[in-house]
């Protein structure tokens, strides 16, 4: 049933990192166009990406309104030349996406080490608090603002001269670790949400090493 000479979308997939959220699907359109609708479980259908020939739709503006809601999207297929045309059933073909809860499922983006500072045998490592597209009172929230104590960072650090890694964890964006005096260390961090069942960890940050510009060394 559905519209003549159109095919339903398939492989509807959510791609989301730090709440930047795009719905992707197949197939590439041949003589057809797509419109996307999105709803929460307690809300109603809102149309986006009208009559597009793309196979993706940026739904960030909708999901950031409440990242803890569960969202459902659907993709409608229409004949390219006549989007008002429908089949004998009177409605266009469509396919539903899987449900998506941004707070539980958005991928954690690769973190960045903002700075490190050595004071004697202590090093303070600071992770950049990345800005998201989630807004509150007309300001964009950081990842920490959104996740609070649900988000921790794991620091991996090792002497430049060896391969043995140590780890530290923090539920802020700062680490204070003990180091051996006179040794250079390298650092990498990973964002983690321990309470999650999926997408718990980010990829590791780029490695930063002491003796490079990003850090500051003060011998006390």
């Amino acid at each position: 049933s559905g519209t003549t000479n159109t095919v339903a979308a398939y492989n509807l997939t959510w791609k989301s990192t730090n709440f930047k959220t795009i719905l992707e699907w197949e197939p590439k359109p041949v003589n057809q166009v797509y419109t996307v609708q999105i709803s929460t479980k307690s809300g109603d259908w809102k149309s986006k990406c009208f009559y597009t020939t793309d196979t993706e739709c940026d739904l960030t503006d909708e999901i950031v309104k409440d990242v803890k809601q569960t969202y459902l999207a659907r993709v409608f297929s229409y004949p390219a030349g006549n989007v008002e045309s429908t089949g004998s059933a009177g409605e266009p073909l469509y396919e539903n996406s899987p449900e998506f809860t941004p707070y539980l499922e958005t991928n954690l983006g690769q973190p960045t080490i903002q700075s490190f500072e050595q004071v004697g045998t202590k090093v303070n490592v600071t992770v950049e608090d990345e800005r998201t597209l989630v807004r509150r009172n007309n300001t964009f929230l950081s990842l920490r603002d959104v996740f609070g104590k649900d988000l921790i960072y794991t620091l991996y650090y090792w002497k430049s001269s060896s391969s043995g890694k140590k780890t530290a964890k923090t539920n802020t964006n700062e680490f204070l670790i003990d180091v051996d005096k006179g040794e250079n260390y390298c650092f990498s961090v990973q964002a983690v949400i321990p309470s999650r069942t999926v997408n718990r960890k980010s990829t590791d940050s780029p490695v930063e090493c002491m003796g490079q510009e990003k850090g500051e060394f003060r011998e006390i």
Epitope: S1, S39, K41, S42, G43, D44, W45, K46, K65, A89, G90, E91, N96
Partner: antibody, heavy 118, light 107 residues
Framework: QVQLVQSGAEVKQPGASVKVSCKAS????????MHWVRQAPGQGLEWMGM????????TYAQKFQGRVTLTVDTSTSTAYMELSSLRSEDTAVYYC???????????WGQGTLVTVSS | DIQETQSPSSLSASVGDRVTITCRAS??????LNWYQQKPGKAPKLLIY???RLQSGVPSRFSGSGSGTDYTLTISSLQPEDFATYYC?????????FGQGTKVEIK
């Protein structure tokens, strides 16, 4: 508890407009869509449209497109339905109904009778 | 637009009877089917949503079933307060549409 209280009955001349209000309480107004449904005397229920109070996004039934305008005032948690170019067939009870999911009307106002008569 | 056809349009029954009302949609509505009860001079009241889920506070004698295009509301043992008009409504796709109603009267 959720309550939707609508404005009182109206009598209008053909060609005039009417604006019905629906004051919501007992929940966060911007979280749920508001729908409008009408019922002509002795007839069934007819969906007119809906509005998302968080951003005033609207969807209207094609039959009412261009004649109905849905608005909200979030400061007073009030939804409004304005119907213009009234004709006798618009005589009906007009209901606001709070959505609780796609196309789901869990809570209803008491209804507002609009009579169109010359 | 999706059309709902309700049957019967009216029925007479006695207290204690089992009553079944059917609703047929013009296309697959993927279980987005709701049932409402309306008494004279009152607003409709949600009974069943998403085919079979009982709205909070609604007695368990009301139940719903169905899939695709065909849906059913059943009252297992009719009570005096159940005499009313019942409407099905599809919530799959705007414009949301209602059946024409089934009036349940006392025999």
């Amino acid at each position: 508890q959720v309550q939707l209280v609508q404005s009182g009955a109206e009598v209008k001349q053909p060609g005039a407009s009417v604006k019905v209000s629906c004051k919501a309480s007992g929940y966060t107004f911007t979280t749920y869509w508001m729908h409008w449904v009408r019922q002509a005397p002795g007839q069934g229920l007819e969906w007119m449209g809906m509005i998302d109070p968080s951003d005033s996004y609207t969807t209207y039934a094609q039959k009412f497109q261009g004649r109905v305008t849905l608005t909200v005032d979030t400061s007073t948690s009030t939804a409004y339905m304005e119907l213009s170019s009234l004709r006798s067939e618009d005589t009906a009870v007009y209901y606001c109904a709070r959505g609780s999911g796609p196309g789901l009307f869990a809570y209803w106002g008491q209804g507002t009778l609009v009579t169109v008569s010359s | 637009d999706i059309q709902e056809t309700q049957s019967p349009s009216s029925l007479s029954a006695s207290v204690g009877d089992r009553v079944t009302i059917t609703c047929r949609a013009s296309q697959d509505i993927r279980n987005y089917l709701n049932w409402y009860q309306q008494k004279p001079g009152k607003a409709p009241k949600l009974l069943i949503y998403h085919t079979s889920r009982l709205q909070s506070g609604v007695p368990s004698r009301f139940s719903g079933s169905g899939s695709g295009t065909d849906y059913t509301l059943t009252i297992s043992s009719l009570q005096p307060e159940d005499f009313a008009t019942y409407y099905c409504q599809q919530g799959n796709m705007p414009p949301y549409t209602f059946g024409q109603g089934t009036k349940v009267e006392i025999k």
